[in-house]
């Protein structure tokens, strides 16, 4: 079992100055140094903050089952205790096919496994949705049109990593909630400089997690109960340099939302942020969208 000993304070004075500077500095990539102030963990402060066994971060990447670390709070020990040694990744022979046929409305049983992303729920139309709490917000360093061109591949790969089903959150008009992300000119810059057309450097993507098949599977103890725990897991993979996802992520987080209204098209959309997005026709800037906290 992992030792429950206090993590050392950040041993390097230089790390204080490097926190949050958009560079993952290897020597500062540790819990004591806050994963370089989030620079190495996709801006997740501490992916293991809920985990009481303090050494689980060390064991996360060891491909061995460490039972004391297999809880949701400890990020399921990177699924090392799951599937009894079964293949952890989608069979490479199927992977391209599964990405091309993800959520295309036709059930492909070869793709209907957690490691292949559950075929985008094409085989689960009769099963009611079971949405995790909140919405997973990713900032991806690809412009929206490029990201949407490869949306099936994007969702299939992310679903496979998280071992559950991901889909774009839809707005009140049934449109995927994928927004341009650009860096603003700092307020201190001269007015003329600030009026340069802001450069679109990525997309802010809002995703829902549908656990209907994850919770139905024989070992259903590894599903992410909320969007923040999924964000923590992605941050953890990034911190240990094991995030095999071909879309460059700037940051990830979970946003709490009020429960979806079933009358809105898309089933999982409506309420909460939608009206605000509609009113603002929002294009998010550095730091992302406003945080709206709702009590459940």
């Amino acid at each position: 079992a992992p030792e429950v000993s206090e993590e050392p304070r950040c041993p390097r004075a230089a790390c204080q100055a490097k926190r949050g500077d958009q560079r993952c500095d290897r020597e500062c990539n540790s819990p004591g140094c806050g994963w370089d102030g989030g620079d190495c963990s996709l801006s997740v402060g501490d992916p293991w903050r809920q985990c009481e066994a303090l050494q689980c971060w060390r064991l996360f990447n060891n491909s061995r089952c460490d039972p004391a670390c297999s809880s949701p709070a400890c990020l399921y020990d990177n699924f090392d205790c799951h599937a009894g040694g079964r293949e952890r990744t989608c069979n490479p022979v199927y992977e391209k096919y599964c990405a091309d046929h993800f959520a295309d409305g036709r059930c492909d049983q070869g793709c209907n496994t957690e490691e292949c992303g559950w075929d985008g729920l094409d085989c689960a139309s009769e099963v009611p949705a079971l949405l995790a709490r909140g919405v997973l917000v990713l900032t991806v360093l690809l412009p929206p049109e490029e990201l949407l061109r490869s949306s099936a591949d994007f969702l299939q790969r992310l679903s496979a990593i998280l071992r559950t089903s991901l889909r774009f959150r839809l707005d009140a008009h049934g449109q995927a909630m994928v927004f341009p992300y650009h860096r603003p000119s700092p307020g201190s810059e001269p007015r003329a400089r600030r009026e340069l057309a802001p450069e679109v450097i990525g997309s802010v993507v809002m995703l829902e997690i549908d656990n209907r098949l994850c919770l139905q599977s024989p070992e259903n103890d590894h599903c992410f109960p909320d969007a923040q725990s999924a964000a923590d897991y992605l941050g953890a993979l990034s911190a240990v340099e094991r995030l095999d996802f071909p879309y460059p992520l700037r940051d990830v987080r979970g946003e709490p939302l009020e429960p979806p209204e079933p009358s809105v098209p898309g089933g999982g959309s409506g309420g909460g942020l939608n009206d605000i997005f509609e009113a603002q026709k929002i294009e998010w800037h550095e730091g992302g969208p406003p945080h709206h906290h709702h009590h459940h």
Partner: antibody, heavy 119, light 107 residues
């Protein structure tokens, strides 16, 4: 559009120093790190180091610590690199580039500054 | 420090042929690789970032692939204007090392 304009070629004597500039335009200068890259004649590219115009923080290739000094002038959106104690090994083209956030790929490059060290 | 090793050092290819060049990292770097093209007398140009993403304006005959330690840049139909040096670069953690380059010539 994004542009990086570098200062002109320099012919310098061994043991002397040289300071070159890289003027950025078309984007918010303080939002992106500026990186410097060396290319000796007929050779590959070598990453020298980078500076954050926002904080002044720097990261260096160990090989260039003590050789290169990186500074910025935010008021003119200009980055500078000074090379000291020059030898013939320092004769090369030096490029400035803009490092993209978090990952540091280089989509924008200056035209290069040729430094020739000769007595 | 992670070393990036490119192979082959040079290749001579006919117009219309498919070309694949390699970049090997001495340790796992995930997807953190970029590819650049450099022609004589010019600054390098970004082709591929984060292993497989084509940069804006890059022709779709250029494809990047790989993960971990082994990466490839493929040109699926060589054009005369593709004759150049090609460099891979490690991203995300400093030092942001470049490979030694592959020289691609027209046969």
């Amino acid at each position: 559009q994004v542009k990086l304009l570098q200062s002109g070629a320099a012919l310098v004597k061994p043991g002397a120093s040289v300071k070159m500039s890289c003027k950025a335009s078309g984007y918010a200068f303080t939002d992106y790190w500026v990186t410097w890259v060396k290319q000796s004649h007929g050779k590959s590219l070598e990453w020298i180091g980078e500076i954050s115009p926002n904080s002044g923080g720097t990261n260096f290739n160990e090989k260039f610590k003590g050789k290169a000094t990186l500074t910025v002038d935010k008021s003119t959106s200009t980055a500078y690199m000074e090379l000291s104690r020059l030898t013939s090994e320092d004769s090369a083209i030096y490029y400035c580039t803009r490092g993209e956030i978090r990952y540091n790929w280089f989509a924008y490059w200056g035209q290069g500054t040729l430094v020739t060290v000769s007595s | 420090n992670i070393v990036m090793t490119q192979s082959p050092k040079s290749m001579s290819i006919s117009v219309g042929d498919r070309v694949t060049m390699n970049c090997k990292a001495s340790q796992n770097v995930g997807n953190n690789i970029a590819w650049y093209q450099q022609k004589p007398g010019q600054s390098p140009k970004l082709l591929i970032y984060y292993a497989s993403n084509r940069y804006t304006g890059v022709p779709d005959r250029f494809t990047g692939g790989g993960y971990g330690t082994d990466f490839t840049l493929t040109i699926n139909s060589m054009q005369a204007e593709d004759a150049a040096f090609y460099y891979c670069q490690r991203l995300y953690n400093s030092p942001f090392t470049f490979g030694s380059g592959t020289k691609l010539e027209i046969k």
